[in-house]
Interface confidence: low
Amino acid sequence: KSSNLEGRTKSVIRQTGSSAEITCDLAEGSTGYIHWYLHQEGKAPQRLLYYDSYTSSVVLESGISPGKYDTYGSTRKNLRMILRNLIENDSGVYYCATWDG
């Protein structure tokens, strides 16, 4: 079974070269793997990385530069992703998603 993407879209504006932090509000009891995607206009949603809550480890997708993104859980219901050294091409809609089964 899969959980749907939930929550309101939040807008973040940052300058080139700066960092941004995005928060993912998780449903109660969400465990396992939390995936982060970037969806840019005219492109397929691209998974950037996923967070393994069992081992608290981050797994980057192939082709993603280490250090560009980081993700961590601040509480059981809240996950954050840091985007560093922003460039114009980082613009888009970032999603978090979980599913099981």
Partner: antibody
Framework: EVQLVESGAEVKKPGSSVKVSCKAS????????ISWVRQAPGQGLEWMGG????????NYAQKFQGRVTITADKSTSTAYMELSSLRSEDTAVYYC????????????????WGQGTLVTVSS | QSALTQPRSVSGSPGQSVTISCTGT?????????VSWYQQHPGKAPKLMIY???NRPSGVSNRFSGSKSGNTASLTISGLQAEDEADYYC????????FGTGTKLTVL
């Protein structure tokens, strides 16, 4: 083992529409990208568009924008591709294909393919 | 969203190695490590041979290998066998998801 079973061959008139289905079994449906790829007789592969059911919205190749609609029914693990305003050049085998890994880009790793559906457009 | 460029045909004798190239741009092949290769026999659905530039799905022979340099990706088939005769297509993620023009491999 993941299996994709497509609907049967269709013969259509120019100007009409066709809707092809693709039923998935043997794996999680929602988190995998489903693409539609067509191949005209003697020609190469052409990506039409795709959908990741958990996202709900589809992406389309520019060439087919406005003429193709891709949907997915999570309750039946079935994806659909509808092509409208058919012309003779749309005569082709239409394949659905699923990515090898979850949450993947559409064309990056199409590890499972349907058997193909031949759509013939003729007056 | 134009197709990636592949040679129309390549050939080789059994036991030899052949390489098929796939040229794109910095917006597709050069910009992502998301190049795949598909094999297609006549009348059959394509089969994934390589993904993420150089990874082989389980069940695919290690005679097939992939690489990338700049905007060009390559598929190398070593120890050529008769059953390798087929059409080969590359693909890449980019501003649109695109396939290559296709290459017919003939085993002499």
């Amino acid at each position: 083992e993941v299996q994709l079973v497509e609907s049967g061959a269709e013969v259509k008139k120019p100007g009409s529409s066709v809707k092809v289905s693709c039923k998935a079994s043997g794996g999680t449906f929602s988190s995998y990208a489903i693409s539609w790829v067509r191949q005209a007789p003697g020609q190469g592969l052409e990506w039409m568009g795709g959908i990741i059911p958990i996202f709900g919205t589809a992406n389309y190749a520019q060439k087919f924008q406005g003429r193709v609609t891709i949907t997915a029914d999570k309750s039946t693990s079935t994806a659909y591709m509808e092509l409208s305003s058919l012309r003779s050049e749309d005569t082709a085998v239409y394949y659905c294909a699923r990515s090898l890994r979850d949450g993947y880009n559409y064309i990056g790793s199409l590890g499972y393919w349907g058997q193909g559906t031949l759509v013939t457009v003729s007056s | 969203q134009s197709a990636l460029t592949q040679p129309r045909s390549v050939s080789g004798s059994p036991g030899q190695s052949v390489t098929i190239s796939c040229t794109g741009t910095s917006s597709d092949v050069g910009g992502y490590n998301y190049v795949s290769w598909y094999q297609q026999h006549p009348g059959k659905a394509p089969k994934l041979m390589i993904y993420e530039v150089s990874n082989r799905p389980s069940g695919v022979s290690n005679r097939f290998s992939g690489s990338k340099s700049g905007n060009t990706a390559s598929l190398t088939i070593s120890g050529l066998q008769a059953e390798d005769e087929a059409d080969y297509y590359c693909s890449s993620y980019g501003s649109g998801s695109v396939f290559g023009t296709g290459t017919k491999l003939t085993v002499l």
